[in-house]
């Protein structure tokens, strides 16, 4: 049938060929493919100043396939669109346009913002942070001994970074002054700062409880956990004193 289509067209176009190259049902030397075999898509290919018809199994970038009964063609996406699913649904916009719900826009609609990496209109994302972690031990110059007045810090994590138009993140660390009972540094004690230091029962005179200085930077409301910690630390102090008195009496 394809050959007959080629033969019949020979009357209309003296240069129509019967032996068409890949995919063409009918063709001519001047125009290339005139029509395509079933399921293939016709597209005009620009070769220099000339346009030649070719038949492809799928459409090139910037085109989408349109199927009509026994005739398929590659149809151009809209002018502002690089890749599309059909005439009304773009999947990638040309430079300078933002994709939103299959359309290419100069500017994103109200309530959305442009993502310049994906070139899409996206929801505005606000910063999200975790709860504060507990206050660090009271330190001074990186040491936890040999001083009375120091500072303590607490941190929180950024759970969600904001997008360009989103609310900025609040501070993620907070420092305040603290007062402790002075404790002599033991030989070789490095008194490492923060969480690197091994947690152990406080020595005599060391209070795990930070006593905020009256000039403290920022104090926050005490959580139930923090209250619980303070009570535990008070109990430990009392136990420490009792143990000390017992050991002293045995020495004598």
């Amino acid at each position: 049938q394809n050959a007959s289509r080629g033969r019949r067209q020979r009357r209309m176009h003296p240069n129509v060929s019967q032996g068409c190259q890949g995919g063409c049902a009918t063709c001519s030397d001047y125009n290339g493919c005139l029509s395509c075999k079933p399921r293939l898509f016709f597209v005009l290919e620009r070769i220099g100043m000339k346009q030649i018809g070719v038949c492809l199994s799928s459409c090139p970038s910037g085109y989408y396939g349109t199927r009509y009964p026994d005739i398929n063609k590659c149809t151009k996406c809209k002018a502002d669109c690089d890749t599309c699913f059909n005439k009304n649904f773009c999947t990638k916009c040309k430079s300078g346009f933002y994709l939103h719900l299959g359309k290419c826009l100069d500017n994103c609609p109200e309530g959305l913002e442009a993502n310049n990496h994906t070139m899409e209109c996206v929801n505005i994302v606000h910063c999200e942070v975790s709860e504060w972690n507990p206050w660090s031990p009271c330190t001074k110059k990186g040491k936890t001994c040999g001083f009375k007045r120091g500072t303590e810090t607490r941190v929180r994590e950024i759970m969600q970074h904001p997008s360009a138009k989103g609310n900025l993140c609040p501070p993620t660390n907070e420092t305040r002054k603290c007062t402790v009972q002075r404790k002599k540094c033991q030989k070789g004690e490095r008194g490492k700062k923060g969480r690197e230091r091994k947690r152990k029962k406080p020595n005599k005179g060391e209070s795990k409880e930070a006593i905020p200085d009256s000039k403290g930077l920022e104090s926050s409301k005490e959580t139930p956990e923090q209250r619980e910690n303070k009570q535990q630390q008070k109990k430990r102090k009392v136990q420490d004193k009792q143990q000390k008195s017992v050991s002293v009496s045995t020495v004598h």
Partner: antibody, heavy 119, light 107 residues
Framework: EVQLQESGPSLVKPSQTLSLTCSVT????????WNWIRKFPGNKFEYMGY???????YQNPSLKSRISITRDTSKNQYHLQLNSVTTEDTATYYC?????????????WGQGTLVTVSA | DIVLTQSPSSMYASLGERVTITCKAS??????LSWFQQKPGKSPKTLIY???RLVDGVPSRFSGSGSGQDYSLTISSLEYEDMGIYYC?????????FGAGTKLEIK
């Protein structure tokens, strides 16, 4: 040379069915695409649809519920039926052919037949 | 559907004159544009297809150009037999649509 010739009644009553035939010589309707086009009195053209070499059809959605395109390969003819006609369907009806996107579109036309819809 | 706006709707021109008729599509039709001529009482005759390709047997004074949404038909030197109505037709997608026509008359 491919030739197309329309035939059918020139007068149809409103609400009736308009039936036209296009007889083709010089080519077989089992190749190419065979179309119906009409031209209204004010010189405005409207594309109606086609029947392909395999017998598949396309109808203009504006007419879809009323139009039917069929063929008779033994007679090398194809037909147009338009149901529930009104005076708005008064037009010159043409059959025409094309062979694919890369060739001349409507390379051959029939001479046209004027159909008047009137009581 | 794609709308084709043809201009002018009618014109007078002298023999030997260069004549240009334009056709603007409501969207990019990717060169799938044809021009045809119709004379009173005659069937239409296709002149040009795929924007600029002349149908066999059509005089070379006829030429077509354009791309995207804008297309034109030019008659380089008008002859008496060129009077008639000229239409543009797009076939980028179905349904195909036609321009409203340009009536060309001799001055």
């Amino acid at each position: 040379e491919v030739q197309l010739q329309e035939s059918g009644p020139s007068l149809v009553k409103p609400s009736q069915t308009l039936s036209l035939t296009c007889s083709v010589t010089g080519d077989s309707i089992t190749s190419g695409y065979w179309n119906w086009i009409r031209k209204f009195p004010g010189n405005k053209f409207e594309y109606m649809g086609y029947i392909s070499y395999s017998g598949k059809t396309y109808q203009n959605p504006s007419l879809k519920s009323r139009i039917s395109i069929t063929r008779d390969t033994s007679k090398n003819q194809y037909h147009l039926q338009l149901n529930s006609v009104t005076t708005e369907d008064t037009a010159t009806y043409y059959c025409a052919t094309y062979y694919g996107y890369g060739g001349p579109w409507f390379a051959y036309w029939g001479q046209g037949t004027l159909v008047t819809v009137s009581a | 559907d794609i709308v084709l706006t043809q201009s002018p709707s009618s014109m007078y021109a002298s023999l030997g004159e260069r004549v240009t008729i334009t056709c603007k599509a409501s969207q990019d039709i990717d060169s799938y544009l044809s021009w045809f001529q119709q004379k009173p009482g005659k069937s239409p005759k296709t002149l040009i297809y795929l924007t600029n390709r002349l149908v066999d047997g059509v005089p070379s004074r006829f030429s077509g150009s354009g791309s995207g949404q804008d297309y034109s038909l030019t008659i380089s030197s008008l002859e008496y037999e060129d009077m008639g109505i000229y239409y543009c037709l797009h076939y980028d997608e179905f349904p195909l649509t036609f321009g409203a026509g340009t009536k060309l008359e001799i001055k």
